[in-house]
């Protein structure tokens, strides 16, 4: 829990430098995002795919999306979860980190030291060992996330499943229910390939709790939708008298020292007949 | 034939709680969320919360957030609102309905006759 | 929340009238749902998608609008047709009904 009071924004005097002064946790150990680059990245045999179970959710179900002041978040049901890592993490939500207009590049994650146009999570907490997501928030083991980093390129019909709803939660605290849909045509091609580190939330309150799976694949997003993420909600309730877009919602890249990042791939990429020579 | 049959209203004292039941039949269960709606006497319908069968999952209207708990038995495909500390204002028929998506968003298609609760001393 | 205002509350009319319920929500919404009801009876689904007809619903009943303001047409009031509808949102949440207009007989 912070110190004094729960106000923080990615911009300003409550921006990421100040998170620390009221959640300590932000200037601890194991912070999130990080770059990957060559130089920490290790091959994990032992690191398999993962199976996403109850990942289709019937459009007969409805799911809030909430504008809560910092992104746009989908509740997702409990029943979703992961299998294949040391005990089941079942769903709890999914949000978006993006960029602007004017500089689309918002990822949390970088590769290389490069942004991606924007960046998903799908949020899970250890079900095995906690009844929600709140409790298992700031234990050991508690979290893992999947980060699905995003290009701008074609248009995605399943990521407009939650855009098209984005214009009724225009401001923080207004929520909308948004039919269920697979969640696993959110996630990229060969999903067999990822990073995987011990990480923490890139939000306050920063628990060091989360294993990371971040996809070694980007996803496409036409430049409209990525627009219209950038251009479409405000960080401010509707009766604000000086409205702040929701813009920029990522954290910096964070130390990365004395530790590795495993991959479930060899960084060898193969080769193809032109680059041969 | 789809049905939902409502049982467990009657007269409540001030203060007082409720439990309400709602068993349904005639469809696979777990595949629709059970929404609450009540409807005071001689006034509008007003939403509740709902609660997804399979697995429990629920969503409240704020305004009876804390005072509202959904809950669910698979075993006898019957969903459960109870209400507490309930006043005059919660006198009204409560209803429980399945809502069917249509290609777009969801209508309530069945709805089920209804019980009256009546908060009085 | 987003409030739904219908007009008129009530209306008296005859039978073989032409009746127009409007239902304005007070922010945008997507599609526009309208219940039936007898009473002492539930609602029954009437339109849905704003202008589709629950099957069963006699081609007399008609639903138009988008936006913020809506509107169910009875072309020619039939006795059977005297209920109070309601409309409904589900664009936002809390999911929201109009007050209701009550249809009675001159």
């Known amino acids: 829990a912070p110190v004094n009071g729960s106000k923080w924004t990615y911009f300003g005097p409550d921006g990421e430098n100040s998170w620390s002064k009221k959640y300590p946790s932000c200037g601890g150990l194991l912070q999130s995002p990080i770059d990957l680059h060559s130089d920490i990245l290790q091959y994990d045999a032992s690191l398999t795919p993962l199976e996403f179970q109850g990942y289709n959710l019937s459009a007969n179900k409805q799911f809030l999306l909430t504008n809560n002041g910092h992104s746009v978040k989908l509740n997702l049901p409990s029943d979703m979860h992961i299998q294949g890592l040391q005990s089941r993490y079942s769903a709890t939500q999914l949000h978006l980190h993006w960029g602007n207009p004017n500089d689309p590049h918002g990822s949390e994650h970088t590769v290389s030291g490069q942004h991606f146009a924007a960046e998903l999570h799908i949020v899970h907490y250890n079900s095995d060992l906690y009844p929600d997501a709140s409790t298992a928030s700031n234990k050991s083991e508690g979290l893992a996330v999947l980060a699905v980093l995003i290009e701008m390129g074609s248009f995605n019909p399943s990521y407009d499943k939650i855009f098209s709803h984005l214009q009724h939660v225009k401001y923080k605290g207004q929520e909308a229910f948004v039919p269920g849909f697979n969640i696993e045509e959110l996630l990229p091609e060969r999903t067999a390939e990822y990073y995987r580190y011990r990480g923490s939330l890139t939000t306050p309150p920063c628990n060091p709790t989360v294993l990371w799976t971040v996809f070694r694949n980007p996803v496409q997003i036409s430049q409209e939708q990525l627009l219209a993420l950038e251009t479409a909600l405000y960080c401010t309730h509707m009766d604000d008298p000086s409205p702040r877009e929701m813009i920029n919602n990522f954290r910096q890249v964070q130390k990365f020292d004395e530790r590795l990042v495993y991959t479930s791939f060899s960084q060898v990429q193969v080769c193809t007949a032109a680059g041969l020579s | 034939e789809v049905q939902l049959v409502e049982s467990g209203g009657g007269l409540v004292q001030p203060g007082g709680s409720l439990r309400l039941s709602c068993a349904a039949s005639?469809?696979?269960?777990?595949?629709?969320?059970i929404y609450w709606v009540r409807q005071a006497p001689g006034k509008g319908l007003e939403w509740v919360g709902y609660i997804d069968p399979a697995n429990g999952d629920t969503t409240y209207n704020q305004k009876f957030k804390g005072r509202a708990t959904i809950s669910v038995d698979k075993s006898k495909n019957t969903a459960y609102l109870q209400m507490n500390s309930l006043r005059a204002e919660d006198t009204a028929v409560y209803y429980c309905s399945r809502p069917i998506y249509y290609g777009a968003y969801w209508y309530f298609d069945v709805w089920g006759q209804g019980t009256l609760v009546t908060v009085s001393s | 929340d987003i409030q739904m205002t219908q007009s008129p509350s009530s209306l008296s009319a005859s039978v073989g009238d032409r009746v127009t319920i409007t239902c304005r929500a007070s922010?945008?919404?997507?599609?526009m749902h309208w219940y039936h009801q007898k009473p002492g009876k539930a609602p029954k689904p009437w339109i849905y998608a704003t202008s589709s007809l629950v099957s069963g619903v006699p081609s007399r009943f008609s639903g138009s609008g988008s936006g913020t303001d809506f509107t169910l047409t009875i072309s020619s009031l039939q006795p059977e047709d005297f209920a109070t509808y309601y409309c409904?949102?589900?664009?936002?949440?809390?999911?929201?009904f109009g007050q209701g207009t009550k249809v009675e007989i001159k």
């Open positions: 005639g469809y696979s269960y777990t595949d629709y969320n």
């Open positions: 922010s945008s919404v997507t599609y």
């Open positions: 409904q949102q589900w664009s936002s949440n809390p999911l929201t």
